[in-house]
């Protein structure tokens, strides 16, 4: 009969190098009697007998592991023991080799200029891969700006547009290469304006062009603003060149105005916008008027058909390109803002109006046109249109105008000839001798003039009724 | 390049309706008024109805009042005629014009090429 | 209803001028009836010449003028050219409100021989 021995391990484990999903064997022979019952620990953790990745065969002296995980590696030992003497232990490890893994792959950025940009690339892979970056067709090179983190990513500070283009990231060991599917680093940059528009000062029925350029990318979207409104009139021509573009807004000037080029381009869900402003400005009506140039003819137009006196001539300012368009197109927007006055005003100053615009005319050797008469004009001013024309001189020491009256080619009162001095100088407004008749009161209303500019308009031919504050006398 | 291109024209009977259609292009449409001008076969031009630039006003030869309505969409650039209870002396080449300037009256200065109307029975 | 009369028929020799009128059967022609002139080959739609009087619409040679004579207007051709051989129509504006009208003459047959 066999002596009993303690176990001795005449095989010890040695360092098991395995590929994943490959199969790894530890061999622990063991020399004892009786025969010693061997377990198996990794990391110092028991390995069930009934875990079915594991195989162990020939008495326990075999460990097999069936397909290799990279879960997998640590210390492997195997202990054995019969009750003869102490316990033995011989441990190993096991080192999972892999090929190199991408296991999160870049994705497609768009980042703003200026900003920093993360590729990312983690990899596994046993040896460690290196990874590396190809842009295009190149290597990647690395500089101050252009970095490959430990994890593997690629990090760009203060991205330029020159960074945009297809970047793929390879990692690489002893055992193989992987890459990474190609994505596409987009460099979006702000909208910028490169020209802005210039501002110009116009005769009334100039054409103007506003020019903008601006550049971005995505390429930015121009629009227009006029006076805080979207441009209602004129024509727009775009054109775009190399991410840049070009707008040029033609204007048929009949008002001032503050226009403004408004570049905008779109970020994911943010916007970026850029601004410039320009203003047109128009030569005072009042000085086109005088020392001007024209031709005695019948009105044609449309607006001013039931003011002005039927088959009358009228003075046309050849001082403009197309006399006719422009001062019909004036008289248009003019009636346009007075859609804001009250029905008091609106028609004494519609005559008003038509009757400076397409003033009467004596067709002489020198066409010569015949100006409202003063009391009218003061009576439109200080009694129908009172509250108007001050909040319309409120504004005008502001230096900005919404609505109302404040575009209009107004006379200046002060400066017609009385009807007094010379009654066959000036042109009367037969709408407000009609009123005399129609009207039997008016609103009081406190001149902001001494009492001798007051309107005095003979009773017996073009007379009006007022109000106590405008005697008749 | 400045076009423009009436359509709609044809045979029609005594008392019948037409609309014609006049296409524009290159040029802002919206900045001018435009005219109907007719031209019997054999015969001489006779202007026939008028609308200033935005379409606030209509103009019309006293022979068509009440039978013919200008209009304009000035979005589609485009020029209307509607021609109702048709006579045979209506029958002519209509031209679509365009104005000098934005009123509706005044010299024409592009002229399209012509429809032909037939009022015949 | 008002007529604008013109001539039915001219004949020019080539280089010559001739002077084409257009009347009204009632009254005289003014700068306030707008006097334009047209001009019109067979086949093709009409070609504007002259606008308010005596202004040339663009692209139109210098030979052609406008202008207004006694109590009509008048088209004169100065240094007539072979292909100036056309129909000339005249054109006036009348009337106010809503009686305005755009009355074009019977025409003027051009030979230019």
């Known amino acids: 009969e066999k002596l009993p021995k303690a176990p001795v391990i005449t095989t010890p484990l040695e360092t098991v190098d395995a590929l994943v999903e490959e199969v790894a064997t530890f061999m622990c022979a063991v020399e004892s009697y009786p025969q010693p019952e061997i377990s198996w620990t990794r990391n110092k953790i028991l390995i069930k007998l009934f875990d079915t990745r594991y195989s162990i065969r020939e008495n326990g002296q075999l460990l097999t592991i069936l397909s290799v995980e990279d879960s997998d590696d640590g210390i492997y030992c195997c202990i054995a023991n019969n009750g003869v003497g102490g316990a033995v232990e011989s441990c190993g490890a096991l080192q999972v080799k892999m090929k190199p893994k991408i296991t999160r792959p870049p994705i497609n950025v768009k980042i703003i200029e200026g900003l920093k940009a993360v590729l990312p690339c983690t990899t596994m892979g046993n040896p460690k891969p290196s990874v590396s970056w190809i842009k295009g067709d190149n290597a990647l090179r690395e500089n101050s700006r252009i970095a490959v983190l430990e994890s593997g990513s690629l990090r760009i500070h203060n991205v330029q547009k020159e960074d945009a283009g297809q970047y793929r990231c390879v990692a690489k060991n002893s055992l193989g290469t992987a890459y990474s599917k190609l994505v596409k680093l987009e460099v979006e940059v702000f909208a910028r304006i490169l020209r802005a528009p210039e501002s110009h000062n116009v005769t009334f029925g100039s054409f103007v062009t506003l020019r903008c350029t601006a550049i971005g990318i995505p390429v930015p979207t121009i629009s227009w603003i006029e006076n805080g409104n979207a441009v209602s009139s004129g024509s727009i021509q775009e054109s775009v060149k190399d991410r840049v573009i070009d707008s040029r807004l033609q204007l048929f000037i009949t008002k001032p105005g503050l226009y403004t080029c408004i570049a905008t381009n779109k970020h994911g869900e943010k916007f970026s916008t850029a601004k410039a402003a320009a203003t047109v400005s128009i030569a005072e009506w009042s000085k086109s008027q005088k020392d001007s140039q024209g031709y005695c003819a019948q009105y044609r137009g449309e607006v001013c058909d039931a003011v002005l006196a039927k088959d009358a001539l009228v003075f046309f300012n050849t001082s403009y390109r197309d006399p006719e368009d422009a001062q019909e197109l004036l008289i248009h927007t003019a009636w346009n803002e007075l859609k804001a006055v009250s029905p008091l005003c609106r028609p004494a100053a519609e005559a008003l109006l038509c009757n400076h615009l397409f003033q009467e005319c004596s067709p002489g050797v020198v066409p010569t046109p015949m100006p409202i008469c003063r009391e009218y004009c003061l009576a439109v001013k200080e009694l129908f249109c009172a509250k108007e024309w001050q909040a319309m001189e409120g504004k005008a020491h502001r230096g900005l105008y919404r609505s109302g009256m404040h575009l209009l080619p107004v006379p200046e009162c002060s400066k017609l000839p009385s009807m007094h001095r010379d009654p066959t100088a000036c042109t009367r407004l037969p709408y407000l001798d009609y009123k005399k008749e129609n009207i039997t009161t008016f609103p009081s209303i406190t001149s902001s003039r001494p009492s001798a500019d007051i309107p005095n308009l003979p009773a017996s031919t073009s007379s009006f009724a007022v109000s106590p504050a405008y005697s008749m006398t | 390049e400045l076009q423009l291109v009436e359509s709609g024209g044809g045979l029609v009977q005594p008392g019948g309706s037409l609309r014609l259609s006049c296409a524009a292009s290159g040029f802002t449409f919206d900045d001018y008024g435009m005219s109907w001008v007719r031209q019997a076969p054999g015969k001489g031009l006779e202007w026939v109805s008028a609308?200033?630039?935005?379409?606030?006003?209509?103009y019309y030869k006293e022979s068509v009042k009440g039978r013919f309505t200008i209009s304009r969409d000035n979005a589609k650039k485009t020029l209307y005629l509607q021609m109702n209870s048709l006579k045979s002396e209506d029958t002519a080449v209509y031209y679509c014009?365009?104005?000098?300037?934005?009123?509706?009256?005044?010299?024409?200065?592009?002229w399209g090429q012509g429809t032909l109307v037939t009022v015949s029975s | 209803q008002a007529v604008v009369t013109q001539e039915p028929s001219l004949s020019v020799s080539p280089g010559g001028t001739v002077t084409l009128t257009c009347g009204l059967s009632?009254?005289?022609?003014?700068?306030?009836?707008?006097p334009d002139w047209y001009q019109q080959t067979p086949g093709q739609a009409p070609r504007a010449l002259i606008y308010s009087t005596n202004s040339r619409h663009s692209g139109v040679p210098s030979r052609f003028s406008g202008s207004i004579s006694g109590n009509k207007a008048a088209l004169t051709i100065t240094g007539a050219q072979p292909e100036d051989e056309a129909d000339y129509y005249c054109?006036?504006?009348?009337?106010?409100?809503?009686?305005?009208?755009?009355?074009f003459g019977g025409g003027t047959k051009l030979t230019v021989l």
């Open positions: 009632s009254g005289s022609v003014t700068s306030s009836n707008y």
């Open positions: 054109a006036l504006y009348m009337g106010r409100g809503s009686n305005k009208d755009y009355v």
């Open positions: 014009a365009k104005r000098s300037g934005r009123i509706a009256f005044g010299a024409l200065d592009a």
């Open positions: 609308i200033p630039w935005n379409g606030g006003s209509t």
